[in-house]
């Protein structure tokens, strides 16, 4: 039977018909009482007082309604949930993940996790309705958890007509003994001791450091990982692990040469709710490597949307060479990460100026051969984009990656819905296409346009009647990603390059073949 439920857009929590709840109003001390009525939340302000007993974790402020028994927690930054029990900054799980309270919500198959409070899970052994739900990390959310001491976090997903448990693709904090760091590396306890310039770190207990805050003498030294060693650490919440060094007999500090543990290609995919011509409206969290590139034009004021881009490392964006034919000065370009709506700032978006960009020397503006460009983001440190649920790198493919013909992949972008539309999409879209065999990616299949070995084709293979809504890239999507699942991670296979019209039956879109440019990419990203 179909159930009417409400989804609170602010908290992503779900509620049954006629259920009520309290919610804090962001950036104010007000509290709203909400009621689920025919699938719509109706909310109004209510008076509150401080709670008579503490009910919020992680420093949350508890307030209870004046005239009934419900309570609400105002959570400090970095925490969420009914009782502030969710750690929104946890980027990985330790050991088996029993204590994991992060926000990863994607199963290994790529399926979206089901909300633990969903009535469909009422008969399951683990749900948000259990009396010990809070202790187990379960509640009104769909985040991966390990309540039964399994080997790693898991969740329920709906597949083959039923709800079954599946392990999550949540990153583990220590993958074997690989010496790398997650997030900003504040939990890094590895043994790297060289800086980015190749200098050796000073021991944290060195006499030279007397008077410095972060040394082995710090009262919290043990908790911060400081001691009688010279290993890189991040005791002060900086961008990444660092250490003290002597440079030309002067005491200073430098970021370390510690690789970050790759979380590339992992994402929290949510099933698109709305079909639109040429694809589906999507959330940026489903495509966190998608960048939007804007350009100032000499002739017109303000910035206008230029092209898509792809985040491949903290400071580098991959895009299409043809986007830069106007030879913009780098300072006329802006890159925005973490944005769902093309021209509406996102709450967690990150905005960057461009240091420089590199267009492939052999780009051919007639055939679009070698249609690839790299943009370096401007930053004061060696880090630019900070990883979050809406900003993350895509994986570059291994050089020998060969996916089977007709593999289903996806592209994303803010481009037009159809070729004749005068406007770009107001919201990010995704499209599902299949990789064409090279025998079907030739000049004769594309009106005698030149097709080179540096290109690949992908398109929607569904049978298209006159009303068919075939998925495809379109104008404005250029420079954006064509990604395919490989080894459990979304891997960049193509860069949106060109096509004949948009969404035409049996006419694939054409993409720059990324495996042909791995050495070029690496070469140009060198420090």
């Amino acid at each position: 039977s179909y159930q009417v439920i409400c989804r609170d857009e602010k908290t992503q929590m779900i509620y049954q018909q006629h259920q009520s709840w309290l919610r804090p109003v962001l950036r104010s001390n007000r509290v709203e009482y909400c009621w689920c009525n025919s699938g719509r939340a109706q909310c109004h302000s209510v008076p509150v007082k401080s709670c008579s007993e503490p009910r919020c974790f992680n420093g949350g402020t508890c307030q209870q309604a004046l005239y009934f028994s419900d309570f609400v927690c105002q959570c400090p930054e970095g925490f969420a949930g009914k009782c502030c029990e969710i750690d929104t900054r946890a980027t990985c799980y330790e050991d088996q993940g029993i204590s994991y309270r992060g926000t990863w919500s994607t199963a290994e198959s790529g399926a979206e996790c089901t909300n633990w409070n969903s009535s469909a899970l009422a008969q399951k052994p683990y749900s948000g309705r259990r009396p010990d739900a809070i202790r187990l990390g379960l509640g009104n959310h769909n985040y991966c958890r390990n309540p039964d001491r399994d080997s790693k976090p898991w969740c329920y997903v709906f597949k083959a007509g039923k709800y079954s448990s599946e392990f999550c693709s949540t990153p583990a904090c220590s993958e074997g003994n690989s010496d790398c760091y997650f997030g900003n590396g504040s939990a890094y306890r590895g043994t790297h001791s060289l800086t980015e310039s190749g200098a050796s770190c000073l021991p944290w207990n060195s006499m030279i450091l007397i008077g410095k805050v972060y040394t082995a003498q710090n009262p919290s030294a043990q908790a911060l990982g400081l001691g009688k060693h010279n290993y890189c650490r991040n005791p002060d919440g900086d961008a990444k692990p660092w250490c003290h060094v002597l440079k030309n007999r002067r005491l200073t500090w430098e970021y370390c040469d510690v690789p970050s543990c790759s979380t590339c290609g992992l994402r929290q995919y949510s099933q698109p709710q709305f079909r639109i011509k040429g694809g589906l409206f999507a959330d940026i969290a489903s495509h966190p490597w998608q960048a939007a590139i804007f350009a100032k034009h000499r002739r017109s004021p303000g910035e206008r949307f230029l092209c898509g881009g792809i985040l491949i490392s903290s400071c580098w964006i991959l895009s299409a060479a043809h986007c830069f034919q106007e030879r913009f000065p780098p300072h006329h370009l802006t890159v925005i990460l973490g944005r769902t709506y093309r021209v509406v700032p996102g709450e967690e978006e990150q905005k960057f100026e461009v240091e420089k960009y590199i267009v492939h020397k052999e780009f051919d503006d007639d055939t679009y051969d070698n249609d690839i460009a790299l943009l370096q983001l401007k930053s004061d440190s060696s880090r630019c984009a900070q990883e979050s649920s809406v900003v993350r790198t895509v994986c570059l493919p291994p050089a020998d990656l060969q996916l089977p013909d007709w593999t289903e992949c996806e592209l994303s972008g803010y481009g037009k819905h159809e070729a004749l539309s005068p406007f770009y999409s107001e919201r990010l879209k995704e499209a599902h296409v299949r990789l064409y065999p090279s025998s079907r990616c030739t000049s004769q299949h594309l009106l005698n346009r030149t097709v080179t070995d540096n290109m690949l084709c992908a398109g929607d293979t569904r049978s298209g009647g006159p009303q068919a809504n075939l998925h495809d890239a379109c104008q404005g999507d250029s420079g954006g990603p064509l990604v395919c699942l490989n080894d459990g991670r979304m891997t960049l296979v193509g860069i949106i390059s060109w096509g004949l019209g948009c969404g035409q039956k049996d006419v694939p879109g054409v993409y720059t073949k990324v495996t042909n440019y791995l050495d070029w990419i690496r070469d140009n990203m060198r420090p």
Epitope: L194, K356, K361, Q376, P397, T515, L518, R522, D523, N524
Partner: antibody, heavy 114, light 112 residues
Framework: QVQLVQSGAEVKKPGASVKVSCKAS??????INWVRQATGQGLEWMGR????????GYAQKFQGRVTLTRDTSISTAYMELSSLRSEDTAVYYC?????????WGQGTLVTVSS | DVVMTQSPLSLPVTPGEPASISCRSS???????????LDWYLQKPGQSPQLLIY???NRASGVPDRFSGSGSGTDFTLKISRVEAEDVGVYYC?????????FGGGTKVEIK
């Protein structure tokens, strides 16, 4: 600290192939380059491999004769040179590249002799 | 290919005196990303080469400050302000901007 340890010396007949290994410890995400040096001669760059993705770049002179591969599970890079000739007798070095070739292996002497 | 030409071929030096080695490239070695990948390596007798200077003028970790690098475009110089006995060996310039990467022919520094 990156450390590179190469396999031992080899003696090969003309026309044969040789495969030299280079095991890395420390930060193993940097390019591994291969450089050779004939006795009493200078240094000659042969090619490079990205240990992560496996992408390669070769000097034209060796294209088709040299193959660079890697096994990420054991942090080891390999250089295979085929159709050996007497002039391939040299010490072969692997070197790890980040901002430059800052770390070098100890070298592997390959002798080609009938 | 970019040809790197070093001079002199051989450089007899007196300890405590300065020394200078020149390196000229057959074309500009500014990379498309804007960097100039011109390095200097020293190979001491019986040893693997070691990095001295990277990207024209940056001293590698642990390299004494008597070594300095300079230059731009196609002309580059390595200077040793006061030569010490341990500085003997063959010095190579190297360009890593254009594939194939290439080394200079080497300059042999020996004590007089």
């Amino acid at each position: 600290q990156v450390q590179l340890v190469q396999s031992g010396a080899e003696v090969k007949k003309p026309g044969a192939s040789v495969k030299v290994s280079c095991k890395a410890s420390g930060n193993t995400s940097y390019w591994i380059n291969w450089v050779r040096q004939a006795t009493g001669q200078g240094l000659e760059w042969m090619g490079r491999i990205d240990p992560g993705g496996g992408s390669t770049g070769y000097a034209q002179k060796f294209q088709g004769r040299v193959t660079l591969t890697r096994d990420t599970s054991i942090s080891t890079a390999y250089m295979e040179l085929s159709s050996l000739r007497s002039e391939d007798t040299a010490v072969y070095y692997c070197a790890s590249y980040y901002y430059a070739m800052a770390y070098w292996g100890q070298g592997t002497l390959v002798t080609v002799s009938s | 290919d970019v040809v790197m030409t070093q001079s002199p071929l051989s450089l007899p030096v007196t300890p405590g005196e300065p020394a200078s080695i020149s390196c000229r490239s057959s074309q500009s070695i500014v990379h498309s990303n804007g960097n100039t990948y011109l390095d200097w390596y020293l190979q001491k007798p019986g040893q693997s080469p070691q990095l001295l200077i990277y990207k024209v003028s940056n001293r590698a970790s642990g390299v004494p400050d008597r070594f300095s690098g300079s230059g731009s475009g196609t002309d580059f110089t390595l200077k040793i302000s006061r030569v010490e006995a341990e500085d003997v060996g063959v010095y190579y310039c190297f360009q890593g901007s254009h594939v194939p990467w290439t080394f200079g022919g080497g300059t042999k520094v020996e004590i007089k």
